[in-house]
């Protein structure tokens, strides 16, 4: 990811950081979806009065975007053809292959809290077995 | 390539005032958080103070809260650290730090600015 | 604020050796923990970030390791240009706070 060049466009977690960190982040899960299909990845802080600065999009230690609070959106240019911003904080992933099963993170960076990471498990499934449904869960 | 150069350092009374520059060249400026890090003689690295990319956050250390003030000019290029009511205590090599896009740590300093309060 | 404890504060050793300075975090930090390089009258210098991520340009001798409240830099070979003093520092919550600093000497 070529730091110094970000492409910037307008405008169940857990907390690692201060003593009095309340937030909790809610998030989409474990879900399933479809090969060649698209999936939207959330997360919401909440019960905490912390600023978000930023939040930071990644799959196990890969970096796919940042969301900036003065700055916006910065999509990592070898994910740019399949990632787009939103809604809100949250991420679509487009054009999906069975590669893409793994885990996700949304690392909020706040203040005075600290950092609060949430974490999302994708299974992209093939056509036929996705259409009847078939999901797992992690335990 | 990154460069970040202080200046505005130097000797000052007990109460007196300093104000210290950081110069940006080598990448674009306005995009990333920049940090005020300093060494007193012979000790470790403490952090002082951080401005984000647009200036809508702004942290202090505790030890300096009230006193110093940060900020930036995206136009210039440039970052401040304004100093009043300056203790002994705050005497120290006064660095600016970028901070990493992704908000995990400072990739490049400068060399450095020596501040010394003394009567 | 997050107490960052470094040991050994100084250490002595001969080019080739691997050596290995222990960072220990007064509460978890997740795996955010950074490690610098200062050289005498120098700026300090990113080695690694969120625990085990090699900065770019740096070489791969230098690694580290660990998540929670324990964190490991690893020199695998010591070079020459690597005796400094080394500083690691937490990025999970401001204030950030750096440890003591380990002097590497040479032996």
């Known amino acids: 990811y070529p730091y110094d060049v970000p492409d910037y466009a307008g405008g169940g977690g857990s907390g690692g950081g201060g003593s009095m960190m309340t937030g909790t982040i809610e998030t989409t899960g474990n879900i399933s979806a479809e090969k060649g299909g698209s999936i939207i990845l959330q997360c919401h802080l909440s019960s905490t009065t912390a600023q978000v600065t930023q939040v930071n999009w990644e799959q196990q230690d890969q970096l796919l975007a940042i969301c900036n609070a003065d700055l916006g959106w910065a999509i990592s240019p070898s994910f740019k053809d399949r990632v787009a911003p939103g809604p809100g904080l949250g991420l679509t992933l487009q054009s999906l292959t069975v590669n893409d099963t793994g885990e996700y993170f949304c690392i909020y960076h706040t203040y005075p809290d600290g950092t609060y990471t949430g974490r999302i498990f994708l299974e992209v499934l093939e056509s036929s077995v996705a259409e009847h449904g078939a999901r797992f869960q992690i335990p | 390539e990154v460069q970040l150069v202080e200046s505005g350092g130097g000797l000052v009374q007990p109460g007196g005032s300093l104000r210290l520059s950081c110069a940006a060249s080598?990448?674009?400026?306005?995009?990333?958080?920049m940090h005020w890090v300093r060494q007193a003689p012979g000790k470790g690295l403490e952090w002082v103070a951080f401005?984000?990319?647009?200036?809508?956050?702004?942290y202090y250390a505790d030890t300096v809260k009230g006193r110093f003030t940060i900020s930036r000019d995206n136009a210039k290029n440039s970052l401040y650290l304004q100093m009043n009511s300056l203790r002994a205590e705050d005497t120290a090599v006064y660095y600016c730090?970028?901070?990493?896009?992704?908000?995990?740590?400072?990739?490049?300093w400068g060399q450095g600015t020596m501040v010394t309060v003394s009567s | 604020d997050i107490q960052m404890t470094q040991s050994p504060s100084s250490l002595s050793a001969s080019v080739g050796d691997r050596v290995t300075i222990t960072c220990r975090a007064s509460?978890?930090?997740?795996?955010?923990l950074a490690w610098y390089q200062q050289k005498p009258g120098k700026a300090p210098k990113l080695l690694i970030y969120?625990?085990?991520t090699l900065q770019s340009g740096v070489p791969s001798r230098f690694s580290g390791s660990g998540s929670g409240t324990d964190f490991t830099l690893t020199i695998s070979s010591l070079q020459p240009e690597d005796f400094a003093t080394y500083y690691c520092?937490?990025?999970?919550?401001?204030?950030?706070?750096f440890g003591g600093g380990t002097k590497v000497e040479i032996k």
């Open positions: 730090a970028r901070m990493r896009l992704d908000y995990y740590a400072m990739d490049y």
């Open positions: 080598g990448f674009t400026f306005s995009n990333f958080g």
């Open positions: 401005i984000s990319s647009g200036s809508s956050s702004i």
């Open positions: 509460k978890s930090i997740s795996k955010y």
């Open positions: 969120s625990g085990s």
């Open positions: 520092q937490q990025h999970n919550e401001y204030p950030w706070t």
